[in-house]
Interface confidence: low
């Protein structure tokens, strides 16, 4: 799916109002410096591509994120604010159903959600520019390897 046509501001609003809180809840009890960011994105459509992949595609060691509250709210936001997104997810639903066996929070899932938090932060300030300067507010962000 090409995320270029999404209403990014509406998705940002959904993230700030609820999704971010659900991610924090999921990560509660985890040290903020426990995981390094290894996944990044360069612009908003690219960020949404990576967010969709990490949220909904089962991975080795973490097969159950799709039914978490933050995932359901992410799916709802994309369905509402990305034209045609819902239609592309019909085939993906079957794969998601197969993944819904047990709700187990593994360390791998925690690491994956930590990556998601980084992607969402990048989505919310894609270029991190300061007015009147070509410098970055957080130079580590520019190089995509900062810690939480």
């Amino acid at each position: 799916y090409d995320f270029t046509n999404c209403d990014f501001e509406k998705i940002k609003a959904a993230y700030l109002s609820t999704i971010s809180k659900d991610l924090i809840t999921y990560m509660s009890g985890t040290k903020s410096t426990e995981f390094n960011n290894t996944v990044s994105c360069s612009n908003r459509p690219h960020c949404l591509t990576e967010i969709q992949s990490l949220t909904f595609n089962p991975t080795a060691g973490c097969a159950s994120l799709a039914k978490e509250m933050f995932a359901m709210k992410t799916k709802a936001a994309l369905a509402i604010w990305c034209p045609g997104y819902s239609e592309t997810q019909i085939n993906a639903t079957q794969a998601m159903k197969k993944a819904r066996k047990s709700k187990v929070t593994t360390n791998k899932c925690l690491e994956q959600v930590s990556q998601l938090q980084g992607l969402w932060r990048r989505f919310n300030r894609p270029l991190l520019k300061q007015q009147g300067s070509s410098d970055y507010k957080d130079d580590d962000d520019k190089h995509h390897h900062h810690h939480h």
Epitope: D2, T4, E9, S42, P45, L127
Partner: antibody, heavy 121, light 105 residues
């Protein structure tokens, strides 16, 4: 300093194709989008499409779909717009415009000087 | 496609007067950008995201609006302000309005 330098004016016959280049400098080419906008004589600006140099992803104005192709050469920091099956109404100035994210919105903050394409038999 | 309608098409005013340019979207958009264009030149960003002036734009310019109705206002026209102004949205792809030409009366 951000600069977008476009290729020179073109004169084409109806039915032919034209490929306009846009050489970017002064910023990281893959960090921002590149739009293509045209303006027929005395007419409004008309958005044609957008490309992400990062991954080559494109989105086109439906009016031009099938006739316009946007590509990039990352190594040369150059964006290209090719328009095929030219007709007289395609006579216009074609602009490339970098799209940056600032002020909570994507905006075309730097523009090329424009390339005049004349379609005439 | 979101259609942007600018009015009036032409605004004939004298230096020192107030100019109000309107841009109406066919459906709600998050923000509106404005560009200034003078004859033979490429457009220049003028107002970002509804109300933020681009670098070098004088404070006599202001932008406002939300939803489907947006406005660019010039409090006191100076000779260099006479030009064509285009609105542009990006909520759904990108489209430009038809432009408002501000000309000397």
């Amino acid at each position: 300093e951000v600069q977008l330098v476009q290729s020179g004016a073109e004169v084409k016959k109806p039915g032919a194709s034209v490929k306009v280049s846009c050489k970017a400098s002064g910023y990281t080419f893959t960090d921002d989008y590149m739009n293509w906008v045209r303006q027929a004589p005395g007419q409004r600006l008309e958005w044609m499409g957008i490309i992400s140099p990062y991954n080559g992803g494109t989105s086109y104005n439906q009016k031009f779909k099938g006739r316009v192709t946007l590509t990039v050469d990352k190594s040369a920091s150059t964006a290209y717009m090719e328009l095929s099956s030219l007709r007289s109404e395609d006579t216009a100035v074609y602009y490339c415009a970098r799209e940056d994210y600032d002020y909570d919105g994507y905006a075309m903050d730097h523009w090329g000087q424009g390339t005049t394409v004349t379609v005439s038999s | 496609e979101i259609v942007l309608t600018q009015s009036p098409a032409t605004l004939s005013l004298s230096p020192g007067e107030r100019a109000t340019l309107s841009c109406r979207a066919s459906s709600s958009v998050s923000y509106m950008h404005w560009y200034q264009q003078k004859p033979g030149q490429a457009p220049r960003p003028w107002i970002y995201a509804t109300s933020n002036l681009a670098s070098g734009v004088p404070a006599r310019f202001s932008g406002s609006g939300s939803g489907t109705d947006y406005t660019l206002t010039i409090s006191r026209l100076e000779p260099e302000d006479f030009a064509v102004y285009y609105c542009q949205q990006w909520s759904s792809n990108r489209t430009f309005g038809g432009g408002t030409k501000v000309e000397i009366k």
